[in-house]
């Protein structure tokens, strides 16, 4: 049985050119994460395996970065990236847990953070 | 460099068994999922199973469910295939393939032949 | 499972023509989709994983694209050492499984 939940940074919102950090958290389970994967809508962008360590897709080499943690960090972001992400927990026994981020990337210099959810 | 050699292929009768093996070289065993394809004379390619590198976790072809057995020796960088209750649709060249991060099949071995005929 | 239609099943082309063969998936991968090419004889050979990446090695003429359901192998300039079969593979889910293969033949 998935007891487990996935906590997320939710919806968030950051300047055209600058950085953002994702993140998503598993709790109230005892289940090994072996690996987490980060999609874009259809695009595979990272990888951290809990034995091979992270792969970054060679397309975003540039702009994404392993870390903090499981978490992946976006930079030089364009309007472009606005979407949503996902983040997949690959888990022994339990199975695959995912959460679901929006992002939103704004011209202007206001951008405010969303508050945090969660996903079961 | 990344080795990968199978052993154990050859004729066996039907209902019969046999187990290939496939010694992995050049990398850290351990570290990758490892997979079993499969691929009958002048036909495609079909995944047969994988096992995690832990060995914990392992999943099946319904073709084969309960009849094969996936497993592995990280001491001895050598994955195993237990082929029980053999049919004559299991005749192929059996492949041994490194999966990292469980994506890909990046390097595969040259394939050893498994002959179910009476 | 997820089935894995690829099209054409052979092809007749020459030294230097633009090959372009197809993946279709019967459900949304995202872009877990591979590229082998496999000669008579031999094992086959990583291409394109993750739908659009070059493994190490690749020549550059090899390029993938293509998320979802829909996928596609582009040989830019087809050499003679490109003749041969390649095969799709989906890695979203357990079982694994490939297409059908498309054999490249010389015209």
């Known amino acids: 049985m998935m007891t487990g939940t996935i906590e997320t940074t939710g919806n968030i919102s950051a300047e055209k050119g600058g950085s953002i950090i994702l993140q998503c958290h598993l709790s109230s389970t005892t289940a090994q994460v072996t690996q987490v994967n980060w999609e874009q809508q259809d695009q595979l962008l990272a990888i951290c395996n809990a034995d091979l360590g992270w792969h970054i897709s060679p397309s975003f080499k540039d702009r994404v970065a392993p870390g903090p943690g499981l978490g992946l960090t976006l930079q030089s972001l364009t309007v472009n990236d606005t979407g949503e992400y996902f983040c997949i927990y690959h888990t022994y026994p339990d199975g695959t847990y995912t959460g679901r981020i929006f992002l939103e990337v704004l011209e202007s210099s206001v951008a405010e953070h969303g508050a945090r959810f969660q996903i079961p | 460099e990344v080795q990968l050699l199978e052993s154990g292929g050859g004729l066996v009768q039907p209902g019969g068994s046999l187990r290939l093996s496939c010694a992995a070289s050049?990398?850290?065993?351990?570290?990758?999922?490892m997979n079993w394809v499969r691929q009958a004379p002048g036909k495609g390619l079909e995944w047969v199973a994988s096992?995690?590198?832990?060995?914990?976790?392992?999943s099946y072809a319904d073709s084969v469910k309960g009849r094969f057995t996936i497993s592995r020796d990280n001491s001895k960088n050598t994955l195993y295939l237990q082929m029980n209750s053999l049919r004559a649709e299991d005749t192929a060249v059996y492949y041994c393939?490194?999966?990292?991060?469980?994506?890909?099949?990046?390097?595969w071995g040259q394939g050893t032949l498994v002959t179910v005929s009476s | 499972d997820i089935q894995m239609t690829q099209s054409p099943s052979s092809l007749s082309a020459s030294v230097g023509d633009r090959v372009t063969i197809t993946c279709r998936a019967s459900?949304?991968?995202?872009?877990?989709l591979n590229w082998y090419q496999q000669k008579p004889g031999k094992a086959p050979k990583l291409l394109i994983y993750?739908?659009?990446s070059l493994q190490s090695g690749v020549p550059s003429r090899f390029s993938g694209s293509g998320s979802g359901t829909d996928f596609t192998l582009t040989i830019s300039s087809l050499q003679p050492e490109d003749f041969a079969t390649y095969y799709c593979?989906?890695?979203?889910?357990?079982?694994?499984?490939f297409g059908g293969g498309t054999k490249v033949e010389i015209k």
């Open positions: 096992i995690k590198s832990s060995s914990s976790y392992t």
């Open positions: 050049g990398f850290t065993f351990s570290s990758y999922s």
């Open positions: 393939a490194r999966g990292p991060y469980d994506t890909w099949l990046d390097y």
């Open positions: 993750a739908a659009s």
């Open positions: 593979q989906q890695s979203y889910s357990t079982p694994l499984t």
């Open positions: 459900q949304s991968i995202s872009s877990y």
